[in-house]
């Protein structure tokens, strides 16, 4: 048993039939010594008396809010949560496996630049009685500070018969050095509580590996005289790290016909302009990637040819 937060305890249980469970001793937070009784949740059944209560925790029916009373007055509450371990593996019932980039990916994180700011998100089908708490650090043995905000519901989607809820959190490394080579990874830890079930999820990454630039901005076309060619120009996204001479991007320019089956013409360039042939009803799209490190491409910025 360990304390998640003041008065909230997590009991770690091996989850199999007829498991012995864990013995837990609760102490009433009061200077009183006599006449103390204990109840669980909304029940008025007295479980025991005295300043301490010893219980055997085996299942969810044994978890919940334990309250000590004296003479009809509530003295204090303790909440017991359960963390299940089945076949040596901690349960992952609360979050959905996103399966990208690999199986057992519950947390996904992205950064728009090298400032030390990043966003993580996760999915669940649970809509109520759900709490998330996020902590992060750079390294784990001698951790350096990363500050995370509150996890918020960022999207709701219908997937077949189920509703899916996306939560996200923004974090910022306290003393980020954008130009420095990373040697220790960022660690992100998410505590999830659904009703009386506790689970924790972790992710470890280097900022350089989760970089995904915003799409190029101000995408414009300039027709070239007496030609089917156009000059496409764009700018670095505002959110990209500066100076651009050091934090450079490379770009992919694509001409796509109306039909997805039509052949795509692609041009790769380090410049912020390119000359392409603009076919009727086609569109021109540009995306960006870190020039010196193959992290994710940005989403496409697009304009119609006409």
């Amino acid at each position: 048993i360990w304390e998640l937060k003041k008065d909230v305890y997590v009991v770690e249980l091996d989850w199999y039939p007829d498991a012995p469970g864990e013995m837990v001793v609760l102490t009433c937070d009061t200077p009183e010594e006599d006449g103390i009784t204990w109840t669980l949740d909304q029940s008025s059944e007295v479980l025991g008396s005295g300043k301490t209560l010893t219980i055997q925790v085996k299942e969810f029916g044994d978890a919940g809010q334990y309250t000590c009373h004296k003479g009809g007055e509530v003295l204090s509450h303790s909440l017991l949560l359960l963390h299940k371990k089945e076949d040596g593996i901690w349960s992952t019932d609360i979050l959905k496996d996103q399966k990208e980039p690999k199986n057992k990916t519950f947390l996904r994180c992205e950064a728009k630049n090298y400032s030390g700011r990043f966003t993580c998100w996760w999915l669940t089908t649970i809509s109520t009685d759900l709490t998330f708490s996020v902590k992060s650090s750079r390294g784990s043995s001698d951790p350096q500070g990363v500050t995370c905000g509150a996890a918020t519901l960022s999207a709701e989607r219908v997937r077949g018969d189920n509703k899916e809820y996306e939560y996200s959190v923004e974090c910022q490394e306290d003393s980020a050095c954008p130009a420095a080579e990373e040697s220790l990874p960022i660690e992100v830890m998410v505590d999830a509580v659904h009703k009386l079930k506790y689970e924790n999820y972790t992710s470890s990454f280097f900022i350089r590996d989760i970089i995904k630039p915003d799409p190029p901005k101000n995408l414009q076309l300039k027709p070239l005289k007496n030609s089917r060619q156009v000059e496409v120009s764009w700018e670095y996204p505002d959110t990209w790290s500066t100076p651009h001479s050091y934090f450079s991007l490379t770009f992919c320019v694509q001409v796509q016909g109306k039909s997805k089956r039509e052949k795509k013409d692609r041009v790769f360039t380090d410049k912020t302009s390119a000359t392409v042939i603009c076919r009727k009803n086609a569109s021109i799209s540009v995306r960006a990637q870190d020039r010196y490190y193959s992290s994710s491409w940005s989403e496409w910025a697009s304009v119609p040819c006409s």
Epitope: K5, K6, D7, V8, Q65, V74, L75, S76, H77, S78, L79, T128, D129, L130, T131, S133, G149, A150, A151, V193
Partner: nanobody, 123 residues
Framework: EVQLVESGGGLVQAGGSRRVSCAAS????????MAWFRQAPGKEREFVAA????????DYADSVKGRFTISRDNAKNTVYLQMNSLKPEDTAAYYC????????????????WGQGTQVTVSS
């Protein structure tokens, strides 16, 4: 600097309703349990209701159970106290408090306090 600012107090007739709010700043709101206490003239400050940092976990004093509802909006960093079927004995200054404990009924369980908002129930 942590600030808790209560609002919504005022004069209300017995049997009526009122909602008081408490806006928090300077703390990670979702990590804190929030509570309402009240103090009537010449009386000690007493616990009214608490909402833990954990979803759906609330606690009420017997005197307000079934009449008052505490709720919180983590996106707005705000906690509310909806008071229905008000009685003259509910007249008091209502104080908002924030603390790291789960659900405490004692004032020592809360580190931060607001300045209070006055609710007067006339008969």
């Amino acid at each position: 600097e942590v600030q808790l600012v209560e609002s919504g107090g005022g004069l209300v007739q017995a049997g009526g309703s009122r909602r008081v709010s408490c806006a928090a700043s300077g703390l990670t709101f979702s990590d804190y349990s929030m509570a309402w206490f009240r103090q009537a003239p010449g009386k000690e400050r007493e616990f009214v209701a608490a909402h833990a940092w954990l979803a759906s976990r609330t606690d009420y004093a017997d005197s307000v159970k079934g009449r008052f509802t505490i709720s919180r909006d983590n996106a707005k960093n705000t906690v509310y106290l909806q008071m229905n079927s008000l009685k003259p004995e509910d007249t008091a200054a209502y104080y908002c408090a924030a603390g790291q404990r789960y659900l405490s009924r004692v004032s020592q369980g809360y580190e931060y306090w607001g300045q209070g908002t006055q609710v007067t129930v006339s008969s």
